[in-house]
Every structure is written in structure tokens, then in C-alpha cells.
């Protein structure tokens, strides 16, 4: 990823610009994007990512609102680093079963399962 | 999702199922699947469920192992599902925002970020 | 920086069972599975098993299923090596070792823990 | 398991040399193959994953290659840190299984 700071600082970062710049964003009243219903928000990395090219189309440039957007695309080109991981890497049945079994895991406790 | 026990407790069994049918799912050594290097599992959902057909094919069908198979379409359903809601109700910036500002926050908090 | 941490060397009687500890540092805690390798004295390496922090699941060598207990303690970032009815032949140096990624290579070791079994 | 045999055992060497280890797997570990460096009385090092990968802060002297069944690890021209014993391990499958190891010392 072309960025000197770690990706943990770099999202820290982000959110702090997102604050800042808050009132210039949603300046456009008639503007419209994709919201996710649910919060597994991995499962929507590319709807936010198209949400976010909408907004920046629509928002006037210069100063540190666009070290946000610059921010938030090198974020999207961890996350599309990270998504290559998911299918790299060809192993033994042993391992997908245990791979497996901690996905389901995490299901289990961790994700926002509606009744 | 056409199943008459919640998500939650299909996971359950399904993680159950799987352990019990371990021996058998592993017996074919030579087969390989694509096992994500890292543990941002939602990101990896499209590839997780392609293994899972892979090793299903692979699979001796019959008893209680049809039915983990069953169970993880279920699962797979399910995340399909929740894939669909990711784009579907269209809000105002204001909303966008404050989904953004929590998808990040959640990235800094809960994801596992290489160094 | 990322390091692993293990308890001192320790002399057990035959039979008896030890507990060697590996305290990680410098990163998540749960997102590696730690590996645990063993070193008889002028002897290879050899694998006993990793755990996963994560959903604290182990797999172990089937030499050593029965004897040897993976755990961890995610409070304290510490993971766990117990091996039981110890014998002569069980004497060495034990390691500790974390996976880089999901069963990938070992990217940072701990520095060993000598066990000696003797009467 | 799969059976990791290294050779040789041991060999001895000159600082400048070219030194060539190599590893064979009892069945295909496809590249899932690292190689390890231990100093007496110091714990074992990782230089190499996946076969070829080097990994950061490892001299490029040291480079790794093979896929399959068979693999080499080669040091360009040894120094004298280089002195040590060399482990493959695989880690392919469970459980995973290293060589016997090679003695690299000084002629």
C-alpha cells in the first residue's frame, strides 16, 4: 500500500477528518447513497466504497478534505489486498475444515444475526 | 431464508455437524482449497462457500453429513441475504456519514490489521 | 516490538507434568495461532501442535495427543504448553512460535524453555 | 506424515563460499516449505517461507527454491554469521514435519 503511515493510524486519521469535514459532506441535501440495513459492515466494503466515490463527486475539493478521500482510497486498496488473501493460498482439506470451523465460530459470536 | 430454525441456532449445528464429520471431510488428500491467510472472515464469504462446494462434491453424501451441507447452503443463503441489504435502501448523506464514521470506527476497533 | 516471552527452565521427576507459559507482545494477541516445537538436547526440531487464540482451538501431533495441552489466557496474552506424564526422553528445549498467518510460517519464536526430566 | 529428508547432514565451508542444501518431501507439500536457521544455544530463526519468499531483514544472500517434492536453499557467499544449522520444515499439512537438519562449518 504507497502509504508511510500504518493502516490502523491511517483509519484513525480518517476518522478524524471524516469529523472534521462533516458539515461541508453533507451539504447536499437532494444527494442519496446506499446505506447498509446491518452492521456486518466486511460484507459491504464495495457499496461503501461506491457511497464514497458518490460523495466525492459531489464535494468541493481543496485543502484537507481531500487528504481525506486520498485517506479513505488507500484504505479501499487495503481492503482489496486483504480480499486477495481470501483465495490465494490453496491448502489441504485439514486446513479449510479448521479454517472453517473458526469462520462458523465467529458467526457464532460475533456477527449481528437477526432472529 | 426456507429453514424453520434461526440463523443462530443453525450455526450452532452446523458447527456441531462439522466436528462430528471431520474424519470424512478430510479423507481426501490431495484435494486443495483456497484458505484465506487472515481473519477478517467476512471479506473471504465468496471464497469460504466456493471451498465449500469444492469439498461437497468431494464428500461421500449420505446421512447426517447431507445435512451439514444442507445447513451451510442455509448459512450461505443467509449471507446472500444480508449482501443484499448492503445496497438496497438508498438515505440521505447524513446517514451515509454516520455509517461510514461507524465502519471505520469498527475498522480501527475490531479488525485485524497487519502491521 | 512483536515478542514472545517464555517462563524458566525446569526440572520435573518422571511421571510428573509441566507447565511452560509464552506471553506474546506487541500485537493482537488473537489473530496469530501460536505453535509450540520441541528440541531434545543435540537433536531436530519437532512440531507438538498450535493453538488459536481466537476460538482457543488446538490441533495437536499425534505423538503427543493425550500428553500435551494447548491453552491460553487472552487476559494476559499468554499461551500454554502442559505436558504430562513426563519421561527421560521428554527433556529439551521447548519453543514457542507464531504462525504469520492462517497455518502459515513461523515469524517470531520465543526464546525456549529447557525441561529436564530426571530422577 | 510427511517425511522431510535433508542433505547433507553436515558440511564444512569456506567464508566466500557458494553453499547448496537441499530438502526432499515424502509427497507434494505444493511450496508450503520454510527454512530455519539456529546458532548454538539461541532459538531458530525463519529466513525463508514459501519456498523462495525471503523474509524482511534477511541478507539476500540467502535465497530459497523448489516446489513439489523438492527444494533448495542456497547462500551465495557464506559469512562468517552464517555458521549454523539449517532446518526445512513443511508446513503443508498436519502435522507439520522439519528435516533432520544440516551443520554448516567453518573448513
Known amino acids: 500500500i504507497p502509504t508511510e503511515i500504518p493502516t490502523s493510524a491511517l483509519v484513525k486519521e480518517t476518522l478524524a477528518l471524516l469529523s472534521t469535514h462533516r458539515t461541508l459532506l453533507i451539504a447536499n441535501e437532494t444527494l442519496r447513497i446506499p446505506v447498509p440495513v446491518h452492521k456486518n459492515h466486511q460484507l459491504c466494503t464495495e457499496e461503501i466504497f461506491q457511497g464514497i466515490g458518490t460523495l466525492e463527486s459531489q464535494t468541493v475539493q481543496g485543502g484537507t478534505v481531500e487528504r481525506l478521500f486520498k485517506n479513505l482510497s488507500l484504505i479501499k486498496k487495503y481492503i482489496d489486498g486483504q480480499k486477495k488473501k481470501c483465495g490465494e493460498e490453496r491448502r489441504r482439506v485439514n486446513q479449510f475444515a479448521d479454517y472453517l470451523q473458526e469462520f462458523l465460530g465467529v458467526m457464532n459470536t460475533e456477527w449481528i444475526i437477526e432472529s | 431464508i426456507p429453514t424453520e430454525i434461526p440463523t443462530s441456532a443453525l450455526v450452532k449445528e452446523t458447527l456441531a455437524l462439522l466436528s462430528t464429520h471431520r474424519t470424512l471431510l478430510i479423507a481426501n488428500e490431495t484435494l486443495r482449497i483456497p484458505v484465506p491467510v487472515h481473519k477478517n472472515h467476512q471479506l473471504c464469504t465468496e471464497e469460504i462457500f466456493q471451498g465449500i462446494g469444492t469439498l461437497e462434491s468431494q464428500t461421500v453424501q449420505g446421512g447426517t453429513v447431507e445435512r451439514l451441507f444442507k445447513n451451510l447452503s442455509l448459512i450461505k443463503k443467509y449471507i446472500d441475504g444480508q449482501k443484499k441489504k448492503c445496497g438496497e435502501e438508498r438515505r440521505r448523506v447524513n446517514q451515509f456519514a454516520d455509517y461510514l464514521q461507524e465502519f471505520l470506527g469498527v475498522m480501527n476497533t475490531e479488525w485485524i490489521i497487519e502491521s | 516490538q512483536v515478542q514472545l516471552v517464555q517462563s524458566g527452565a525446569e526440572v520435573k521427576k518422571p511421571g510428573a507434568s509441566v507447565k511452560v507459559s509464552c506471553k506474546a507482545s506487541g500485537y493482537t494477541f488473537t489473530n496469530h495461532h501460536i505453535n509450540w516445537v520441541r528440541q531434545a538436547p543435540g537433536q531436530g526440531l519437532e512440531w507438538i501442535g498450535y493453538i488459536n487464540p481466537y476460538n482457543d482451538y488446538s490441533r495437536y501431533n499425534q505423538k503427543f495427543k493425550g500428553r500435551a495441552t494447548l491453552t491460553v489466557d487472552k487476559s494476559t496474552s499468554t499461551a500454554y504448553m502442559e505436558l504430562s506424564s513426563l519421561r527421560s526422553e521428554d527433556t529439551a528445549v521447548y519453543y514457542c512460535?507464531?504462525?504469520?498467518?492462517?497455518?502459515?510460517?513461523?515469524?517470531?519464536w520465543g526464546q525456549g524453555t529447557l525441561v529436564t526430566v530426571s530422577s | 506424515d510427511i517425511q522431510m529428508t535433508q542433505s547433507p547432514s553436515s558440511l564444512s565451508a569456506s567464508v566466500g563460499d557458494r553453499v547448496t542444501i537441499t530438502c526432499k518431501a515424502s509427497q507434494d507439500i505444493n511450496s508450503y516449505l520454510s527454512w530455519i536457521q539456529q546458532k548454538p544455544g539461541k532459538a531458530p530463526k525463519t529466513l525463508i517461507h514459501r519456498a523462495d519468499r525471503l523474509i524482511d531483514g534477511v541478507p539476500s544472500r540467502f535465497s530459497g527454491s523448489g516446489s513439489g517434492q523438492d527444494f533448495t536453499l542456497t547462500i551465495s557467499s557464506l559469512q562468517p554469521e552464517d555458521f549454523a544449522t539449517y532446518y526445512c520444515l513443511q508446513y503443508d499439512d498436519f502435522p507439520y514435519t522439519f528435516g533432520q537438519g544440516t551443520k554448516v562449518e567453518i573448513k
Open positions: 512460535a507464531r504462525d504469520y498467518g492462517n497455518f502459515w510460517y513461523f515469524d517470531v
